[in-house]
Amino acid sequence: FERTRSLQDPCSNCPAGTFCDNNRNQICSPCPPNSFSSAGGQRTCDICRQCKGVFRTRKECSSTSNAECDCTPGFHCLGAGCSMCEQDCKQGQELTKKGCKDCCFGTFNDQKRGICRPWTNCSLDGKSVLVNGTKERDVVCGPSPADLSPGASSVTPPAPAREPGHSPQ
């Protein structure tokens, strides 16, 4: 089949990194600078992805493979193939339309990306707060007060007036 196909279509003999040049009697010509063909038998080479602006080059374009971009420092990739970059924030912050903002009380973000999430409500699982939450860290839930025999632990349950998961202001 391959022999038959190549007799019918001389372009099928053109390897990756070349294109079948109709202007030159269908001979295989190398891809021009800043273009590539990743498969054989191509009639054109594709323009290389250009990594500039917020993007930086992770892998250079070659005659047989496209360039790959990632984001410049202070930004992180979003979307398939890093189609977009988004500004990093600090832990304890989230990105809003007006820039990086601290997490509201009762929420946290332990990454440089993403949104602030509510602290775990320990009482929903019948547990108590072992370590208070911060802007950067979730609360740590411990055993429920009923599970602790008197004097067995130095952890003091939060005062009844305070919601579980809240840290002192």
């Epitope: 800043n34 054109t44 594709d46 323009i47 290389c48 992805r49 250009q50 500039k52 602006g53 917020v54 993007f55 930004f75 979307g79 398939a80 193939g81 189609s83 977009m84 970059c85 988004e86 500004q87």
Partner: antibody
């Protein structure tokens, strides 16, 4: 509030030179790539050039390479487009625009300045 | 260069109509496609970035879709202020704009 204001447009003869300026305000100027885009009378938009935040990287459309030079002065929050060997086909409104620094889109534009090349 | 072909070049529509503008790239550009609106004598205004993300402050009647080579800008219910010219722009490589689509009052 982000603002971009172009200036320097004028009537110039073919072969002449002109320098356009763009003043930016309301954002950290040096953090952003910036672009020039032009529009010939009654025609569509044509990207002309862009420049990195520190001015070390510059790219141009083929039709202006070797004739136009894009530069910036971050201390003055200003961009400059030095246009030499001007041709009749360079006649256009020239806009400066800010790269949004997320995917190559231009999120803020100036009001434009008209360059007319005619004898 | 990557050529961006917009269709139609102009269209007539009425207030309340659903309007669709298409943009085709001469090769795959993933989702590196942006849409702008321009009114006479004014600078372009960004509507959609990364093919489908709505720019802050732009009404939700504008939406974008597509990836690879074929992209669409849709105005779900045309308003009087939407009569303008719309441009697509690829940011995959050296930026290029489509030829524009003028939306006129029927």
């Amino acid at each position: 509030e982000v603002q971009l204001v172009e200036s320097g447009g004028a009537l110039v003869q073919p072969g002449g030179s002109l320098r356009l300026s763009c003043a930016g305000s309301g954002f950290t100027f040096s953090n952003f790539w910036m672009h020039w885009v032009r529009q010939a009378p009654g025609k569509g938009l044509e990207w002309v050039a862009d420049i990195s935040g520190d001015g070390s990287e510059k790219y141009y459309v083929d039709s202006v390479k070797g004739r136009f030079t894009f530069s910036r002065d971050n201390a003055r929050n200003s961009l400059y487009l030095q246009m030499n060997s001007l041709r009749i086909e360079d006649t256009a409104v020239y806009y400066c625009a800010r790269d949004a620094m997320r995917g190559g889109d231009l999120d803020y534009w100036g009001q434009g300045t008209l360059v007319t090349v005619s004898s | 260069d990557i050529v961006m072909t917009q269709t139609p070049s102009s269209l007539s529509a009425s207030v309340g109509d659903r309007v669709t503008i298409t943009c085709r790239a001469s090769q795959s550009i993933s989702s590196y496609l942006n849409w702008y609106q321009q009114k006479p004598g004014k600078a372009p205004k960004l509507l959609i970035y990364a093919a489908s993300s709505l720019q802050s402050g732009v009404p939700s009647r504008f939406s974008g879709s597509g990836s690879g080579t074929d992209f669409t800008l849709t105005i779900s219910s045309l308003q009087p202020e939407d009569f303008a010219t719309y441009y697509c722009q690829q940011s995959y490589s050296t930026p290029h704009f489509g030829g524009g689509t003028k939306v006129e009052i029927k």
